[in-house]
């Protein structure tokens, strides 16, 4: 049976097809291309006898046809109008005639794509930005590119106007992007230059470091502050509510007790409007912001109840601080048979009770911090009980 | 059920002050945008600004900028159209209208029933 | 600014007709339009968003199409209630413009 097969289907404009013919019979007289689906005279592209060799174009020969005379048609230079269907008609020597139809598509070579946009600065949270490729054009498919990988699953991305606008609801700091769009048909693909969002955001709450809280008298105090911020923040510090001065960092040299306070940083982003402060407390103190664990020690760990007395003594290295104990999570002295002595470093019990076995330990603190040491145990034995009523134990 | 009902009619002179407001109830309010729309007499809607009351953040017609101020109160869930000094072309109809979720690719679903504003000497 | 022309600027029709209006951007919006029913004495009242999303509890008989810059809205057989002024609105870009609106009257 006479078929024709198109080479290529799909045909870049500009370029050209080849319409080869199958299983063309013998005996032939000519044969002759139409455009369509039908032999129609008005549309005949061209004719070709045979016997003398010669083609005569037809009224719908644009000059771009040549024929072969295995009956196979080119057509060079191809238009978008050229897309459709072609008859051949076989013309044979009992002048009983064939015909066969084949077709094919001319797509355009697609330009280089851009990427237009709704919003060029949006703001975090509460602004949309529609993207959308540039040019329009048609049997095109367009494909979205997000950090070079294929957009992600999102209820924050929508597709809309056939793929062709890519719209981020609600866009974040984290969709700068960037973004690319890439058209295709059956027979080219181009990407556009990649776009990214600037988006305008923060100030997030500013931290001010270091974190320390306590300095030395004659040291000097540098603190930074730092918020996220899109454009930059604008940093003010202020010293126990009073302005200070316009700058991220803030240094004070040789501090004293006086310069003990609160200190803000206000960060401000003039896009957004948008204000937030972070207040840190600063304490000059000659004191030690870290008291040292105390060691108790004890003269014995085990006495006789009614007769021995005991001496618990608590020992540490800082200076300018306070000691107290604690016995049973009861702060002492609690009878009087109990006496300190020595700044309160020496806990002396005379005599020793039943009711004072137990756990003891001591606690040294200044303004600024305190430390516990680890507990001791003290055992309080008898060694008879006392005799009542003139008879001996047993 | 959502609701935006806004101030009754105002009568003014040319140069007074005016605020008109509009509250949201029903929903969310710090959580929509406010829009603002103008309609003269006889004639179409005008697009004048829209706010978050979640933090004010306002964008404005450049036909309008400078000529109102848009502001809102997320404690009492109202948003606030004023102008220091009105001209007698400022005499319309003005509708709020809640906006979501962003103040482009929004639609305006639910209108206040509007406030008639006549400035004449 | 983008420009939205409606057209025609009025229309007269029965009950049970078919009426279309249509309206153009003057730059690509994408899908971002919205259609507004007004009636006289009344606030706009939200019919289409996004094209051709028909808003909750607005009669099927509405519906929106269109892309780009060409949009339509369809009543598909006019009801006395239908007889209104009729706007459309792009939301791409800020400002937010509308048409000069289409009035729908009784023949």
């Known amino acids: 049976q006479l078929t024709t097969e198109s080479m290529p289907f799909n045909v870049a404009e500009g370029k050209e097809v080849l319409l080869l013919v199958h299983n063309l019979p013998q005996q032939l007289f000519g044969y002759s291309w139409y455009k369509g689906e039908r032999v129609d005279g008005n549309r005949q592209i061209v004719g070709y006898a045979i016997g003398t060799q010669q083609a005569t174009p037809g009224p719908a020969n644009s000059g771009r046809e040549t024929i072969y005379p295995n009956a196979s048609l080119l057509i060079q230079n191809v238009t978008q109008n050229d897309t459709g269907f072609y008859t051949l008609q076989v013309i044979k020597s009992d002048l009983v005639n064939e015909e066969a139809t084949g077709q094919f598509h001319v797509y355009p070579e697609l330009p280089k794509p851009s990427i237009s946009s709704n919003n060029s600065n949006p703001v975090e949270d509460k602004d949309a930005v529609a993207f959308t490729c540039e040019p329009e054009t048609q049997d095109t498919t367009y494909l979205w590119w997000i950090n070079n990988q294929s957009l992600p699953v999102s209820p924050r991305l929508q597709l809309s106007n056939g793929n062709r606008t890519l719209t981020l609801l609600s866009v974040t700091r984290n969709d700068t992007g960037p973004y690319e769009c890439e058209i295709q048909n059956p027979v080219s693909a181009n990407r556009s230059d990649p776009v990214t969002l600037n988006v305008t955001y923060g100030p997030d709450t500013p931290t001010i470091s270091p974190s320390d809280t306590y300095y030395r008298p004659g040291a000097n105090l540098s603190l930074s502050c730092y918020a996220a911020s899109n454009p930059p923040a604008q940093y003010s510090w202020l010293i126990n509510g009073t302005f200070q001065q316009s700058t991220q960092e803030l240094f004070i040299p040789n501090i004293t007790v006086n310069n003990s306070g609160s200190y803000t940083c206000h960060a401000n982003n003039s896009v957004t409007g948008c204000n937030r402060t972070t207040v840190k407390t600063i304490i000059v103190t000659e004191l030690s912001p870290v008291v040292a664990k105390p060691q108790i020690k004890a003269s014995k760990t085990t006495v006789t109840g009614d007769k021995d007395s005991v001496n618990l003594t608590c020992s540490t290295n800082d200076t300018g601080i306070s000691i107290r104990w604690f016995f049973k999570n009861q702060s002492l002295p609690s009878s009087e048979r109990m006496k300190l002595s020595q700044g309160n470093t020496t806990l002396s019990i005379n005599p020793v009770k039943r009711e004072d076995a137990g756990t003891y330990w001591c606690e040294v603190f200044n303004p600024i911090s305190k430390n516990q040491s680890d507990p001791i145990m003290l055992n309080v034995n008898y060694n008879a009980l006392p005799q009542e009523n003139g008879l001996s134990p047993g | 059920e959502v609701q935006l009902v806004q101030s009754g009619a105002e009568v003014k002179k040319p140069g007074e002050s005016l605020k008109i407001s509009c509250k949201g109830s029903?929903?969310?309010?710090?959580?929509?945008?406010i829009g603002w729309v103008r309609q003269m007499p006889g004639k179409g809607l005008e697009w004048m600004g829209i706010?978050?009351?979640?933090?004010?953040?306002?964008r404005y017609s450049p036909s309008f900028q400078g000529q109102v101020t848009i502001s809102a109160d997320k404690s009492i869930s109202t948003a606030y159209l004023q102008w220091s000094s009105l001209k007698a072309s400022d005499t319309a109809m003005y509708y709020c209208?809640?906006?979501?979720?962003?103040?482009?690719?929004?639609?305006?679903?639910?209108w206040g029933q509007g406030t008639l504003v006549t400035v004449s000497s | 600014d983008i420009q939205m022309t409606q057209s025609p600027s009025s229309l007269s029709a029965s009950v049970g007709d078919r009426v279309t209006i249509t309206c153009r951007a003057s730059?690509?919006?994408?899908?971002?339009l919205n259609w507004y029913q007004q009636k006289p004495g009344k606030a706009p009242k939200l019919l289409i968003y996004?094209?051709?999303s028909l808003q909750s509890g607005v009669p099927s008989r509405f519906s929106g199409s269109g892309s780009g810059t060409d949009f339509t809205l369809t009543i598909s057989s006019l009801q006395p209630e239908d007889f209104a002024t009729y706007y459309c609105?792009?939301?791409?870009?800020?400002?937010?413009?509308f048409g000069q609106g289409t009035k729908v009257e009784i023949k």
């Open positions: 209208a809640r906006g979501y979720p962003a103040p482009t690719v929004n639609d305006l679903d639910y």
């Open positions: 029903g929903y969310s309010f710090t959580s929509y945008w």
């Open positions: 706010i978050y009351p979640g933090d004010s953040d306002t």
């Open positions: 730059q690509s919006i994408s899908s971002y």
């Open positions: 996004a094209a051709s």
């Open positions: 609105q792009q939301s791409y870009s800020t400002p937010l413009t």
